[in-house]
């Protein structure tokens, strides 16, 4: 009863440092509460980017100071990460946990490589 999690392999952030991707999971049970965590893996370091727990049928809400926003629809979560800079380029992995009711299930995606390119500063114009 493995839980498969799918996410795109590559995403290019916008010039404003915003990247969006879908994290989809195949639920083996009838969960009413789901936790979605985005982890960033760079070199051998792992950092939690953001996490949200939501009730099925309700919106997922991240903490106010989170750099993530998202919406949910069935077994699909649309994630948006903002405020990204070139140094944030890396592999962003979606971890899904079916929290309630028991049994608990874990699913981890293969990761989305997000490329962030800092915009070139505008040249001074002489008028």
């Amino acid at each position: 009863k493995a839980m498969h999690v799918a996410q795109p392999a590559v995403v290019l952030a916008s010039s404003r440092g915003i990247a969006s991707f879908v994290c989809e999971y195949a639920s083996p049970g009838k969960a009413t509460e789901v936790r979605v965590t985005v982890l960033r893996q760079a070199d051998s370091q792992v950092t939690e980017v953001c996490a949200a727990t939501y009730m099925m049928g309700n919106e997922l809400t991240f903490l106010d100071d989170s750099i993530c926003t998202g919406t949910s629809s069935g077994n699909q979560v649309n994630l948006t990460i903002q405020g990204l800079r070139a140094m944030d380029t890396g592999l962003y992995i979606c971890k899904v946990e079916l929290m309630y009711p028991p049994p608990y299930y874990l699913g981890i995606g293969n990761g989305t490589q997000i490329y962030v390119i800092d915009p070139e500063p505008c040249p001074d114009s002489d008028f």
Epitope: K1, A2, R35, P102, P103, Y104, Y105, L106
Partner: antibody, heavy 119, light 106 residues
Framework: QVQLVESGGGVVQPGRSLRLSCAAS????????MNWVRQAPGKGLEWVAV????????HYADSVKGRFTISRDNSKNTLYLQMNSLRAEDTAVYYC????????????WGQGTLVTVSS | EIVLTQSPGTLSLSPGERATLSCRAS?????LAWYQQKPGQAPRLLIY???SRATGIPDRFSGSGSGTDFTLTISRLEPEDFAVYYC?????????FGQGTKVEIK
């Protein structure tokens, strides 16, 4: 560095109660699922219970369901295990263990506290 | 619940030899971890996700496998590697451990 220190073990009679504590330090306690794992003398490891993040969700092994209650105080970075209606077969070293970044394996363990249920 | 069966129960080897420990699941397992435990000590995480080494674990320890068959390999046994090794599945609750394999000095 991550540190987990259990306390509260001891000798108790069958049918009585005991509360274990686990003081955590060196990490953001509320970001992790926390577990109790036990080991009877000379035996293998048995997962007992988990409590998630904010403390609302808890799961238990069938062997302790209805008798043991796991709880946490994130303001005190402390994990608890309330053990009621203790039986001789609950005799074990009880370990507090942190869940990992990538799921509920156990990446850090306390030193353990021995609970002996005997008349 | 998923039952994990480890084999052999005891492995008698000499320092410098290669150790191969097996963990077989009663049904397909998504996520598996390996632990080492020495007498009087708490277990120590070696491997998670079937093949990822935990922080500070020497590269002589490696994990492999998927589905129902998993292996922990110690390429060259050091004196400090003689201990009991446990596998654990954590893809779905209840999380279960194998009964352990004791690696002893021959």
């Amino acid at each position: 560095q991550v540190q987990l220190v259990e306390s509260g073990g001891g000798v108790v009679q069958p049918g009585r109660s005991l509360r274990l504590s686990c003081a955590a330090s060196g990490f953001t306690f509320s970001n992790y699922g926390m577990n109790w794992v036990r080991q009877a003398p000379g035996k293998g490891l048995e997962w007992v219970a988990v409590i998630w993040y904010d403390g609302r969700n808890k799961h238990y092994a069938d062997s302790v369901k209805g008798r043991f209650t796991i709880s946490r105080d994130n303001s005190k970075n402390t994990l608890y295990l309330q053990m009621n209606s203790l039986r001789a077969e609950d005799t074990a070293v009880y370990y507090c263990a942190r869940g990992g970044d990538w799921g509920p394996y156990f990446d850090y363990w306390g030193q353990g506290t021995l609970v002996t249920v005997s008349s | 619940e998923i039952v994990l069966t480890q084999s052999p129960g005891t492995l008698s080897l000499s320092p410098g030899e290669r150790a191969t420990l097996s963990c077989r699941a009663s049904q397909s397992v998504s996520y598996l971890a390996w632990y080492q435990q020495k007498p009087g000590q708490a277990p120590r995480l070696l491997i998670y996700g079937a093949s990822s080494r935990a922080t500070g674990i020497p590269d002589r320890f490696s994990g492999s496998g998927s589905g129902t068959d998993f292996t922990l390999t110690i390429s060259r046994l050091e004196p400090e590697d003689f201990a009991v090794y446990y596998c654990q599945q954590y893809g779905s609750s209840p999380w279960t451990f194998g009964q352990g394999t004791k690696v002893e000095i021959k």
